[in-house]
């Protein structure tokens, strides 16, 4: 029997200071650019080397960004989300959702040392 793939979802508040070249990441998603089926959320698609996000180290490719400076990113057009980041100021607070893939053993069995519960 094959093992199943589960996901551990955690949220984190990340405070970034805009660097000389900005925040240093790319996004995908929005109501007009659904990256994940049935989810119009905003996701990180690229972290730029030596950018503010990379130097901070907490934001990861694949993270879902829930809010920027307290402003919810639900139901936004893609460009509106981009503009929100561009106009977010020098100190930027991101509420993000990390989705960590966890490989479990066969269904009904948990292998020794499996930390998933």
């Amino acid at each position: 029997m094959n093992g199943r793939v589960d996901y551990l979802v955690t949220e984190e508040e990340i405070n970034l200071t805009r660097g000389p070249s900005g925040l240093g990441f790319n996004i995908v998603g929005g109501t007009d650019q659904q990256y994940v089926s049935n989810d119009s959320g905003i996701y990180v698609s690229r972290i730029k080397e030596n950018g503010a996000a990379a130097l901070d180290g907490r934001l990861q490719e694949g993270d879902k960004i829930l809010s920027v400076n307290g402003q919810d990113l639900k139901n936004l057009l893609h460009q509106d989300a981009v503009d929100l980041f561009r106009n977010a100021g020098y100190a930027v607070s991101l509420r993000v959702q990390h989705r960590l893939q966890v490989q479990n053993g066969p269904i009904g069995h948990r292998g020794e040392g499996d930390p998933s519960g």
Partner: nanobody, 127 residues
Framework: HVQLVESGGGLVQAGDSLRLSCAAS????????MGWFRQAPGKEREFVAH????????YYADSVKGRFTISRDNAKNTMYLQMNSLKPDDTAVYYC?????????????????????WGQGTQVTVS
């Protein structure tokens, strides 16, 4: 990983037209931010044109403005560069480049370092 294949180059005379294509792999083509660059022998790679994910926003180098048109067809996973009124100065290897998603910073679209994936290039020679 994204694979890019350019085509459409060739040898033409001054004043002629060519249409370059860049076919890209990947199911998320419609999220790609894309650009064309060129490199002439003995010169640095030079920005030519840029297009955003939806095709609604384009930028051009001054040297090609009014002569070249960048476009994309997200249904065909392909970007194009229509080159009209070609000049000998346009002779170069033309490369397409991609970054996945939209930069949240004001985009430095002419900087090659902003792009993650590059094609092998197609030669354009204008005599």
């Amino acid at each position: 990983h994204v694979q890019l294949v350019e085509s459409g180059g060739g040898l033409v005379q001054a004043g002629d037209s060519l249409r370059l294509s860049c076919a890209a792999s990947g199911r998320t083509f419609s999220t790609y931010t894309m650009g064309w660059f060129r490199q002439a022998p003995g010169k640095e790679r030079e920005f030519v044109a840029h297009i955003n994910w939806s095709g609604s926003s384009t930028y051009y180098a001054d040297s090609v403005k009014g002569r070249f048109t960048i476009s994309r067809d997200n249904a065909k996973n392909t970007m194009y560069l229509q080159m009209n009124s070609l000049k000998p100065d346009d002779t170069a290897v033309y490369y397409c480049a991609v970054t996945i998603g939209s930069p949240v910073d004001s985009y430095r679209h002419s900087d090659p370092l902003e792009y993650d994936y590059w094609g092998q290039g197609t030669q354009v020679t204008v005599s």
